[in-house]
């Protein structure tokens, strides 16, 4: 990761993708340490911030403007050399977001996938973006970039992610950029949580008072396991919703969550999954499906338990 013999390594924390008005720390790592360094911007725009200045350990940039977007390099202090400075570092591209309308992000076949599968994340917009960028939250590496394909007044790009492993689970956002301003990105798409299932043993799902109930009768679905899951997730077939609850340790040494569905109006097939707090987007195998039947006069379904999963913050911790 570090630079060569006389080449520092320039990196950004927390990310090279910075929202307009945000801050970012640039670190110049040179010769097994963070020394004094100088910073350069390749297109030489916005240079007053670096004007003859030497920085110590890190440079905090911000609040950023579109003019901050571009390619940076640093030189480390090398007192006994002819120039006093090292060779230039690797190039580091800083991208500033929030400059155009947000694109949309969709997952095909969907955001809930089995380990080893491949998902296509499609970013699209009616703004004629030249490039699309896909970024996973919490990752400091540069985002993936694709050229936008334009059809019928829509620009889009398909990012293939897979085979899916736990490290690829998480919250994704995409951005677009227009010609001539490649590092001035749009506002982020709404976040899309990619969840990987099938990594741990399946929990069991049961219904109280039972899987067949009278219309209007209160129903509770219980998800439990011997595994010490922190969170249980309940999904209903045909709905892009998931409901989650913290697992509670029981006296029989199982971990359980009870999902009250309220008065029964309509049946459905339910599944539940377990997950751990440390990896909120990596779920267990699905429980066996549970068919809940309602006898009497079925009308509409139960009220939606949560917002659609792409916006529900599955991959954020449940506090």
């Amino acid at each position: 990761l570090m630079g060569g013999q006389d080449k520092p390594f320039l990196s950004a924390r927390p990310s090279t993708v910075v929202p307009r008005g945000g801050h970012v720390a640039l670190q110049c790592h040179y010769r097994r340490g963070f020394n004094n360094f100088m910073l350069y911007k390749e297109d030489r725009s916005h240079v007053p911030i670096f004007h003859g200045r030497i920085f110590q350990e890190s440079f905090i940039m911000g609040p950023v403007t579109p003019a901050h977007a571009g390619t940076y390099r640093c030189r480390g202090s090398r007192p006994h050399s002819l120039t006093g400075w090292s060779a230039p570092s690797n190039p580091l591209v800083i991208m500033v977001t929030g400059n155009h309308r947000k694109p949309s992000l969709l997952a095909h076949p969907g955001p809930l996938l089995k380990s080893g599968e491949t998902v296509i994340l499609q970013c699209w917009s009616d703004v004629m973006f030249e490039h699309f960028f896909l970024h996973r939250e919490g990752i400091s590496e540069d985002p993936s970039r694709l050229v936008g394909q334009i059809h019928d007044g829509v620009s889009k790009a398909n990012f293939s992610i897979g085979p899916l492993m736990p490290v690829l689970a998480g919250t994704y956002r995409c951005y677009g950029s227009v010609p001539h301003s490649p590092y001035q990105l749009s506002a982020p798409s709404d976040p899309l949580d990619i969840v990987i299932t099938g990594l741990y043993e399946k929990p069991s799902l049961s219904a109280q008072p039972g899987p067949t109930v009278q219309a209007g009768e209160n129903v509770t679905l219980s998800c439990s396991s011997w595994s010490s899951y922190d969170i249980y997730h309940l999904s209903r077939e045909g709905e892009a919703h998931e409901r989650r609850l913290r697992a509670v340790p029981k006296v029989n040494r199982t971990f359980q969550a009870d999902f009250p569905l309220g008065p029964a109006t309509h049946g459905g097939t339910y599944r539940c999954f377990g997950s751990f707090r440390a990896l909120p987007c990596v779920w267990s195998n699905s429980s066996d499906p549970l068919l809940v039947s309602v006898t009497g006069n079925p009308s509409s379904s139960w009220p939606s338990p949560t917002e659609p999963s792409s916006k529900s913050g599955i991959c954020r911790h449940l506090h």
Epitope: G21, A25, H51, R53, E57, S58, I60, G62
Partner: antibody, heavy 118, light 107 residues
Framework: QIQLVQSGSELKKPGASVKVSCKAS????????MQWVRQAPGQGLEWIGW????????KYAEDFKGRFVFSLDTSVSTAYLQISSLKAEDTAVYFC???????????WGQGTTVTVSS | DIVMTQSHKFLSASVGDRVTFTCKAS??????VAWYQQKPGQSPKLLIY???TRHTGVPDRFSGSGSGTDYTLTISSVQAEDVAVYYC?????????FGGGTKLEIK
């Protein structure tokens, strides 16, 4: 939303020390720095210096070297300003403000009044 | 140190007026100028940085311009809530320095 909350007013005797705290929330503390500014009664704004919350490296304006010390506790997203050997002329409102190497102070604390009087 | 001079200590305007604050730097500060608003009994608030970039949530009646050593902050249509002291600051080189402030009063 981004907030900086400072500790309460202080009344001190000349020669004493005071430590002002500034607790940040709503952003990742270590990706920005904390600037410190003071405002004497009825006067304008005077920059004391700043601390890089990522590296912990402080920088002081010439007039504030020695008696003024910045510190951080990143585990609780808090910056501190300690002033020792207080003098009557240190009586002022002390502000913390988020900002980095570019010197733009985009969010400010509510201010802490330090009164030095015998 | 760079000295920032706000020559007017006071400005008076009626609601709806256009008002301009001026600030002069003792040397070229390459557009690295910010403007702050401080209402009575409150902490300063950032309005403008890099001469003309409006901070998040700042109404578009506030705008900035300038280059070299001369900078201005304009309020296109003054509102009663704009009563405050306005400070310019150079963020070109340390020590960051502020102007003495201009107090806006409503007639």
């Amino acid at each position: 939303q981004i907030q900086l909350v400072q500790s309460g007013s202080e009344l001190k005797k000349p020669g004493a020390s005071v430590k002002v705290s500034c607790k940040a929330s709503g952003y990742t503390f270590t990706t920005a720095g904390m600037q410190w500014v003071r405002q004497a009664p009825g006067q304008g704004l005077e920059w004391i210096g700043w601390i890089n919350s990522h590296s912990g490296v402080p920088k002081y304006a010439e007039d504030f070297k020695g008696r003024f010390v910045f510190s951080l506790d990143t585990s609780v997203s808090t910056a501190y300003l300690q002033i020792s050997s207080l003098k009557a002329e240190d009586t002022a409102v002390y502000f913390c403000a988020r900002g980095g190497d570019e010197g733009v102070m985009d969010y400010w604390g509510q201010g802490t009044t330090v009164t030095v009087s015998s | 140190d760079i000295v920032m001079t706000q020559s007017h200590k006071f400005l008076s305007a009626s609601v709806g007026d256009r008002v301009t604050f001026t600030c002069k730097a003792s040397q070229d500060v390459s557009t690295a100028v910010a403007w702050y608003q401080q209402k009575p009994g409150q902490s300063p608030k950032l309005l403008i940085y890099w001469t003309s970039t409006r901070h998040t949530g700042v109404p578009d009646r506030f705008s900035g311009s300038g280059s070299g050593t001369d900078y201005t902050l304009t309020i296109s249509s003054v509102q009663a809530e704009d009563v405050a002291v306005y400070y310019c600051q150079q963020h070109y080189s340390t020590p960051w320095t502020f102007g003495g402030g201009t107090k806006l009063e409503i007639k």
